[in-house]
Interface confidence: low
C-alpha cells in the first residue's frame, strides 16, 4: 500500500511537470483537481515549482469556483489548498487498496 502511494506521489509530480506541455496530461490533472477539490501534490504551492508555469498561477481546476483564468494571480481564499496526493490517496485507501 505504501509503495503504491509513493508511486502515485511520484507520478503525480511528474505529470505536473508535463502539465503546460501536454494536453492529455493537463486534462487528467484538471479532472483530478476539480473532482477531488485539491491542488498540487502536497499543496497548491507545488505549482510554483513548475518552471514552465507562469508565476502566481495555478491551473484553473484548483479554483473553488472554476472560471476561465481564475488561477491567474489567484487569491489563496479562492483555491483548494489541500494537496491531491493526500486527498486522492485517502480515497484510494478507502475504495481501492
Amino acid at each position: 500500500r505504501d509503495k503504491v502511494m509513493s508511486e502515485f506521489n511520484n507520478n503525480f509530480r511528474q505529470q505536473m511537470e508535463n502539465y503546460p506541455k501536454n494536453n492529455h496530461t493537463a486534462s487528467i490533472l484538471d479532472r483530478m483537481q476539480a473532482d477531488f477539490k485539491c491542488c498540487g501534490a502536497a499543496n497548491y504551492t507545488d505549482w510554483e515549482k513548475i518552471p514552465s508555469m507562469s508565476k502566481n498561477r495555478v491551473p484553473d481546476s484548483c479554483c473553488i469556483n472554476v472560471t476561465v483564468g481564475c488561477g491567474i494571480n489567484f487569491n489563496e481564499k479562492a483555491i483548494h489548498k489541500e494537496g491531491c496526493v493526500e486527498k486522492i490517496g485517502g480515497w484510494l485507501r478507502k475504495n481501492v487498496l
Epitope: N22, R31, D35, V66, G69
Partner: antibody
Framework: QVQLVESGGGLVKPGGSLRLSCAAS????????MNWIRQAPGKGLEWITY????????YYADSVKGRFIISRDNTKNSVHLQMNSLRAEDTAVYYC????????????WGQGTTVTVSS | DIQMTQSPSSLSASVGDRVTITCRAS??????LNWYQQKPGKAPKLLIY???SLQSGVPSRFSGSGSGTDFTLTISSLQPEDFATYYC??????????FGQGTRLEIK
Amino acid sequence: QVQLVESGGGLVKPGGSLRLSCAASGFTFSDYYMNWIRQAPGKGLEWITYINNGGYTKYYADSVKGRFIISRDNTKNSVHLQMNSLRAEDTAVYYCVRDPRMYYGMDVWGQGTTVTVSS
Amino acid sequence: DIQMTQSPSSLSASVGDRVTITCRASQSISSYLNWYQQKPGKAPKLLIYAASSLQSGVPSRFSGSGSGTDFTLTISSLQPEDFATYYCQQSYSTPPITFGQGTRLEIK
C-alpha cells in the same frame, strides 16, 4: 470585445483544397485552445479538430484525419484550417471556437464560414 | 468514443411553459456536460457548463442538472426568444468532443 471572425470559405470542386482562417481579438489568444466545429446543412454539430494553446498538440476527428491540418500563429492571433482532398460530405458551415481547456464548455464561437464542395 | 443521445428530437411548447430536455451519455461523464442554444443562421451559444453552472449573461430561467450519464436542461418559463435548437456536449473524454443530435424547440 471578445471576437472570432472566420474567412476563406467558398465553392470548391471535389478533390480541391481550401484554407480557412480565424482572426481572434479581445482576449489573450495564447491562453486558449482552439477548435474547428462544422455543421452540414440541416444537420447537427460535428467537432473536427483542435489545437492546444502552444500549437504543438493537435487532434482530428476520424472523418478528416489525413486531409485537414490545423495550425495557429500566436503572434498574429490567428488559427487556420487547411482542407485538402475535399469531398461533397465536407460541405458545411465551419465555426472557429474558443476552448478554455478547463473542460467547461466552448464559450466563444465565430459567425461561421460556408464551404461548399460541388462539381 | 462517448455517444450522446438527446430526447426528444423535437418538441412543441407555448410561451410560459416549463420545458425539459434530456441528454444521456453512453458512459459516465461525471459533470462534464455542456448545453448550447442555436438559432437559425446563427452560431451556437454556451448556456450551461459543468452540468449545472450558468454561463455569464444567460437568463436564470435556464438551469441544468444531472451527473454520471443522465442530464437535463430545464427552461422554467419559455420566452419567445427561447425557440431554437439545443445541443448537449460532453467534455469528459476528449478527443473527440461529442455532441448530442440536437433538440428542436418549436412554438405550439
